[in-house]
């Protein structure tokens, strides 16, 4: 059974992940650049179901494409801290949260999403899990 300390750790990790995803989304929403149209044509795969931490496998599999799109966006008007480091940090959190005991085959929805829809989906996921922990 999860202890209060492990629950607290999970909550902190989810909050960290949530902040990172929100930072990316805010950067994109405030982004004024011709490359935005190009960014929005990039399709992200969404989970068919995302209700448990193990479903973060679906986020993990899309982190590389996310990094590529953010690399495309880098400019004077849109500057995240080093994209590689940011995605690497997210990846570490995701791996810890989902655990490595069982390797889940991610089941994707049929419908693809833009980067904005994708980030919003995982932000909502984090908020939902955090609310159940508090």
């Amino acid at each position: 059974a999860p202890t209060s300390s492990s629950t607290k750790k999970t909550q902190l990790q989810l909050e960290h992940l949530l902040l990172d995803l929100q930072m990316i989304l805010n950067g994109i929403n405030n982004y004024k650049n011709p490359k935005l149209t190009r960014m929005l044509t990039f399709k992200f795969y969404m989970p068919k179901k995302a209700t448990e931490l193990r479903h973060l496998q679906c986020l993990e599999e899309e982190l590389k494409p996310l990094e590529e799109v953010l690399n495309l966006a880098q400019s004077k008007s849109f500057h995240l801290r080093d994209t590689k480091d940011l995605i690497s940090n997210i990846n570490v959190i995701v791996l810890e949260l989902k655990g490595s005991e069982t390797t889940l085959m991610c089941e994707y929805a049929d419908e693809t999403a833009t980067i904005v829809e994708f980030l919003n989906r995982w932000i909502t996921f984090c908020q939902s899990i955090i609310s159940t922990l508090t």
Partner: antibody, heavy 119, light 107 residues
């Protein structure tokens, strides 16, 4: 200018495995955001997407073919490959490899290779 | 799977004619619709992506429009090199699917 070139046997016996390779020249298969696809076209018919691979090894297949398809990548050779098992006559088609950015439009295609399934 | 239905399946036209090809998706696909041209014995070539964006190097006589389920490819003034088969393709749903094609022939 990136170019794609398919290679492999033009004749495969029923129940065997069809194997094709696509060689990428003029650019790196590890270029960010690009996906490497296989698409086929049955004689005189329309186009059917088979699946893609990303340089990291992530794949996605058409559900209608998923049980028989394997796509792999060799970044050192700048190549990706298709294996289609248990082939039947209905798998006779022109097989194309194609590139897309962000799982969108297929912007660069190989010239295609005709594969006939026959004993 | 999303069904993509093109009409007409074939048409005859003369050089200089304005040609319109339509593509209908069985479900809404936003603006994730691409158009390709294919000549006999050749691979398809992308003309338009995201419903109305020009692929670089494509002549301006080609244009695309539409969103949701109904899309149109227009060739404003048909040229001899435009006689070919045209395909639409959706990229909003998995698997990506193509229309059955529209063959543009010389009248």
């Amino acid at each position: 200018q990136v170019q794609l070139q398919e290679s492999g046997p033009g004749l495969v016996k029923p129940s065997q495995t069809l194997s094709l390779t696509c060689t990428v020249s003029g650019g790196s298969i590890s270029s960010g955001g690009y996906y490497w696809n296989w698409i086929r076209q049955h004689p005189g018919k329309g186009l059917e997407w088979i699946g893609y691979i990303y340089y990291s090894g992530n794949t996605h297949y058409n559900p209608s073919l998923k049980s028989r398809v394997t796509i792999s990548v060799d970044t050192s050779k700048n190549q990706f490959s298709l294996k289609l098992s248990s082939v039947i006559a209905a798998d006779t088609a022109v097989y194309y490899c194609a590139r897309d950015w962000g799982r969108d439009a297929f912007d660069i295609w190989g010239q295609g290779t005709m594969v006939t399934v026959s004993s | 799977d999303i069904q993509m239905t093109q009409s007409p399946s074939s048409l005859s036209a003369s050089v200089g004619d304005r040609v319109t090809i339509t593509c209908r998706a069985s479900q809404t696909i936003s603006s994730y619709l691409n158009w390709y041209q294919q000549k006999p014995g050749k691979a398809p070539k992308v003309l338009i992506y995201a419903a109305s964006s020009f692929q670089s190097g494509v002549p301006s006589r080609f244009s695309g429009s539409g969103s949701g389920t109904d899309f149109t490819l227009t060739i404003s003034s048909l040229q001899p090199e435009d006689f070919a088969t045209y395909y639409c393709q959706q990229s909003h749903y998995i698997p990506r699917t193509f229309g059955q094609g529209t063959k543009v022939e010389i009248k």
